[in-house]
């Protein structure tokens, strides 16, 4: 049935970038400016997305594909297809309801987005801290204290409070 219908339906011949114009005896008309059809057989063309304000154009609209937006510097995309732009924070911060806040002691964020996460607890893996953690960087774990040769030393920072309900490793 589907095959029979498509053979009889003149609109099925209209390729992407056109629409089946009911006002013109169902002939295939090109999509008007600022509109597109990404598949064949369409009876209308969709309006192109416009990247305004904090959005900027990543890919221009064409007759067969919608425009694609990203965010201006200082913001990053949220949601499928960059439906929203969200403020960047600095490394060592996380975006809260009250704006960008520094990571609490014992946590870090090495990206301009995302949340602060706890430092790796080297001792839970039988290792020692080679490089202290900061707000921007996780600690670096080294060999276990027993593996250190005489005279070698490892940095031992104050241990962060253990996170409730879960354990970093």
């Amino acid at each position: 049935f589907e095959r029979t219908r498509s053979l009889q339906d003149p609109c099925s011949n209209c390729p992407a970038g056109t629409f089946c114009d009911n006002n013109r005896n169902q002939i295939c008309s090109p999509c008007p400016p600022n509109s597109f059809s990404s598949a064949g057989g369409q009876r209308t063309c969709d309006i192109c997305r416009q990247c305004k304000g904090v959005f900027r154009t990543r890919k221009e609209c064409s007759s067969t594909s919608n425009a694609e937006c990203d965010c201006t510097p200082g913001f990053h995309c949220l949601g499928a297809g960059c439906s929203m732009c969200e403020q960047d924070c600095k490394q060592g911060q996380e975006l809260t309801k009250k704006g960008c806040k520094d990571c609490c002691f014992g946590t870090f964020n090495d990206q301009k987005r995302g949340i602060c996460r706890p430092w790796t607890n080297c001792s839970l893996d039988g290792k020692s801290v080679l490089v202290n953690g900061t707000k921007e960087r996780d600690v670096v774990c080294g060999p276990s204290p027993a593996d250190l040769s005489p005279g070698a030393s490892s940095v031992t920072p104050p241990a962060p409070a253990r996170e409730p309900g879960h354990s970093p490793q």
Partner: antibody, heavy 118, light 106 residues
């Protein structure tokens, strides 16, 4: 489009081991925090573990420490959960998910069933 | 450890408004997320950052967060909305889930 395809679920005897896999595509896996969540039959969601983008740090729920190990291979765009000393109460559907922090767990695998029974 | 509490079940008639609550200490200091899980299916994020909707989620889903309680509101509830709903937040960088609420559309 983003896809997380899971495998490795099976029927295993108590005390046995299993390794779950999660193959990622459609996003920059090597820049993403990843997590494992499980759901026992008729129960709610339980967070198990997450792992840093470079794999250098892992975080676990206290009750599983020492038995389960989360790991990743960024060259293969894959996430793993090694489960040892399995118990009957570990029977559950196990899900991998991308953990976007303030954007939530925005994409989930289809789940893989682990049954621990003698 | 941080805990989120949800009612086990909520019932609503088709076309009516369903409200599912999630409570936790100083929850409005944190962002809350909501997931829908239909029977036999994988969880789907329906609300993030308290009130934002991911692309593809119907407008009838909305969220709020005030005091110790976050609320998922489904306006004009439809039969397809019958599912389990879970709230989630982060505590020290780790996801924490509520126990889940079964929404029944009568």
């Amino acid at each position: 489009q983003v896809q997380l395809v899971q495998s490795g679920g099976d029927l295993v005897q108590p005390g046995g081991s299993l390794r779950l896999s999660c193959a990622a595509s459609g996003f920059l896996f090597s820049n993403s925090w990843m997590t494992w969540v499980r759901q026992a039959p008729g129960k709610g969601l339980e967070w198990l573990a997450n792992i840093k983008p470079d794999g250098s740090g892992q975080y676990y729920v206290d009750s599983l420490r020492g038995r389960f190990t989360i790991s990743r291979d960024n060259a293969k765009n894959s996430l793993y959960l090694q489960m040892n000393s399995l118990r009957v109460e570990d029977t559950a559907m196990y899900y991998c998910a991308r953990d976007r922090g303030n954007d939530g767990l925005d994409y989930w695998g289809q789940g893989t069933l682990v049954t621990v029974s003698s | 450890s941080y805990e989120l509490t949800q009612p086990p079940s909520v019932s609503v008639s088709p076309g009516q408004t369903a409200r599912i609550t999630c409570s936790g200490e100083k929850l409005d200091d944190k962002y809350t997320f909501w997931y829908q899980q239909r029977t036999g299916q994988t969880p789907v994020l329906v609300i993030y950052q308290d009130k934002k909707r991911p692309s593809g989620i119907p407008e009838r889903f909305s969220g709020s967060n005030s005091g110790n309680t976050a609320t998922l509101t489904i306006s004009g509830t439809q039969a397809v909305d019958e599912a389990d709903y879970y709230c989630q937040t982060y505590d020290s960088g780790a996801p924490v889930f509520g126990g889940g609420t079964k929404l029944t559309v009568l």
